[in-house]
Interface confidence: low
């Protein structure tokens, strides 16, 4: 008769993937089809993998996701021409542990944080074999880093200054696949290092080749010599320049730039130690060509006396205003109405005071430091009849 060997009476497994093994001897050796595994609910599993030596057949079964309800008595069954044998064994499926609370930040500096990992209470089963503190900067596409922790209080070192981090704790119980899901996430920000950036930073185009950066006067809190470092880089080209400006000045003209190009500028106040960078500011140099026509022009919401006109404009041409020109079809050129919209970020406008049942010719064009765009064609707008009063 076949014999089932090396099968313990009790197995503790972690929920998740599980590959139980049934090993049997006998003559003839059991084949793949002759070995099965029966779950507590009566489901019969067949081997996913099978090997044999001169002495044993080994059936390897795959349960892709074993869960606590699968706990109970499983049976390894071997049925050959020489006879049938069954070996029951107990499987206890454990729930992977997960902390209920996010870790707490006790203290932070510019490059460290002291954390209480708050690993208890946790959901799921113990005992906990090990604990990991996972952390990463929020705005970086970096993988989570982790450290193994033994104490509830742990210090994270080598952090970046003025950076927001995410933290969570992962608990690991004994046995293969014992890593639980990470617990709730805590966010914190490390402290700054060095002087804060200049206040009131403002970046405006001055010409086709210059931008002007201004800031509020800086009043140092110590006797240390200081200067303002300004970094400017082109968005379109990989071109960067750093300029040192004496600390008593409140502006700098960034020159030798290219027309119609977008630049990113930031500044910091340096002493012996480097200060903290400001947020990025962006601006375009003035255009060296006429602006392109507004695009996606659409006339909608037409009534007897009004209509809405909408459009989009391209970035980078120093467009300062949009003009809508309209006149009654067939009237003289000089009888038109111009509406000048000085805020180029506005992308729609309601024409009012129109005549009912009238055809209008509408033109729209953009203006920049060079001049006005040339409308390719006019748009026709016909107002509706005036509705009769009841």
């Amino acid at each position: 008769t076949p014999k089932i060997v090396d099968l313990p009476d009790h197995i503790e497994v972690n929920s998740g993937k599980f590959n139980p093994i049934c090993k049997a001897s006998g003559w003839p050796l059991p084949t793949n089809e002759e070995m099965t595994l029966v779950k507590p609910d009566g489901t019969v599993l067949h081997p996913k993998d099978f090997n044999h030596t001169d002495h044993f057949s080994v059936a390897i079964f795959t349960i892709h996701r074993i869960l606590p309800p699968d706990s109970g008595v499983w049976v390894c069954s071997v049925n050959t021409v020489a006879g049938m044998v069954e070996k029951p064994f107990n499987i206890s499926v454990k729930v992977l542990p997960k902390p209920l609370n996010a870790p707490n930040v006790i203290d932070t500096g510019h490059n460290f944080a002291v954390i209480n990992i708050s690993s208890e209470p946790y959901f799921g089963d113990g005992p906990i074999k090990s604990k990991k503190l996972l952390y990463k900067p929020v705005n970086h596409y970096e993988a989570w880093q982790h450290i193994q922790v033994t104490n509830e209080i742990v210090t994270l070192n080598y952090l970046e200054p003025r950076t927001e981090y995410e933290l969570c704790v992962q608990l690991v119980r004994r046995g293969e696949g014992g890593e639980g899901h990470p617990g709730p996430v805590r966010r914190f920000t490390t402290a700054s290092i060095g002087l804060p950036p200049p206040r009131g930073l403002n970046l405006l185009p001055k010409s086709q080749t210059t931008l002007n950066l201004t800031w509020q006067p800086i009043f140092p809190s110590s006797e240390d010599d200081f200067y303002v470092e300004v970094e400017r880089r082109s968005v379109q080209k990989s071109d960067q320049q750093n300029i040192k400006v004496p600390g008593n000045l409140t502006s700098v003209l960034l020159n030798n730039l290219h027309p119609r190009e977008q630049y990113v500028v930031r500044a910091r106040v340096n002493t012996k130690a480097q200060g903290e960078w400001s947020e990025d500011l962006t601006a375009w140099t003035l255009s060296d060509i006429l602006p392109p026509q507004p695009e996606n022009i659409k006339i909608s919401n037409i009534t007897h006396s009004s209509a809405v006109i909408s459009w989009t404009i391209l970035d980078g041409y120093s467009i300062s205003s949009i003009t809508i020109r309209y006149k009654v079809q067939g009237k003289n050129e000089d009888q038109h109405v111009d509406v000048k919209i000085k805020n180029a970020t506005i992308t729609q406008y309601q024409l009012k005071g129109l005549e009912p049942e009238t055809a209008y010719q509408v033109d729209i064009f953009a203006e920049n430091n060079i001049g006005s765009s040339n409308p390719a064609f006019s748009h026709e707008l016909v107002t509706l009849p005036e509705s009769q009063a009841p």
Partner: antibody, heavy 115, light 107 residues
Framework: QVQLQQPGAELVRPGASVKLSCKAS????????MNWVKQRPGQGLEWIGM????????RLNQKFKDKATLTVDKSSSTAYLQLSSPTSEDSAVYYC????????WGQGTTLTVSS | DIQMTQSPSSLSASLGERVSLTCRAS??????LNWLQQEPDGTIKRLIY???ILDSGVPKRFSGSRSGSDYSLTISSLESEDFVDYYC?????????FGGGTKLEIK
């Protein structure tokens, strides 16, 4: 048949990061863990860690957590081991091996850290 | 971490002789143990997995067994190509750990 191809040797200067490769063929690359193992001259074998190419889940031996970074390129079925700030202690043969059961091994890359 | 203590570290034997190498696990690893063979040129090949299952193409003179926490690799009749290095490897609990190795030398 299953094959793991590794370059025979790499020379790197101390402190300069190095990336070792392991190109897999003959099986579904995204279905098996890929292990990395270190062997110093005249010494035994030491497990560095493993990565699952399907989702880049990584398990590292704590001893190597600040030293090794494991990555994969699914499009070329290649696994990589990057060693940061190498020193003479990192001069060794580095093997890749397939799966939880280490059923197939690469030939190993001999890394020499020397100025 | 689970320690795998492999013995002997070196062994001199004659052609045709029967030898056994042993690995002792510091914790329960079930049958999660491989035996590996390393050639002088560094090539590593798995001989046995799950304690006793022979890899395909591995000669039948190799066998694996277990007694409690002791795991053995037995070569029933040594041939000239068997005089190389052998390692055990446990894969029951991460980090996976290797035995220190056994150098099998010809007497």
């Amino acid at each position: 048949q299953v094959q793991l191809q590794q370059p025979g040797a790499e020379l790197v200067r101390p402190g300069a990061s190095v990336k070792l490769s392991c190109k897999a063929s003959g099986y579904s690359f995204t279905s098996y863990w890929m292990n990395w193992v270190k062997q110093r001259p005249g010494q035994g074998l030491e497990w560095i860690g493993m990565i699952h190419p399907s989702d880049s889940e990584t398990r590292l031996n704590q001893k190597f957590k600040d030293k090794a970074t494991l990555t994969v390129d699914k499009s070329s079925s290649t696994a990589y081991l990057q060693l940061s700030s190498p020193t003479s202690e990192d001069s060794a043969v580095y093997y890749c091996a397939r799966g939880n059961y280490f059923d197939c091994w690469g030939q190993g890359t001999t890394l020499t850290v020397s100025s | 971490d689970i320690q795998m203590t492999q013995s002997p570290s070196s062994l001199s034997a004659s052609l045709g002789e029967r030898v056994s190498l042993t690995c002792r696990a510091s914790q329960d690893i079930g049958i999660s143990l491989n035996w590996l063979q390393q050639e002088p040129d560094g090539t590593i090949k798995r001989l046995i997995y799950a304690t006793s299952i022979l890899d395909s193409g591995v000669p039948k003179r190799f066998s694996g067994s277990r007694s409690g926490s002791d795991y053995s690799l037995t070569i029933s009749s040594l041939e000239s190509e068997d005089f190389v290095d052998y390692y055990c490897l446990q894969y029951a609990s991460s980090p996976w750990t290797f035995g220190g190795g056994t150098k099998l030398e010809i007497k």
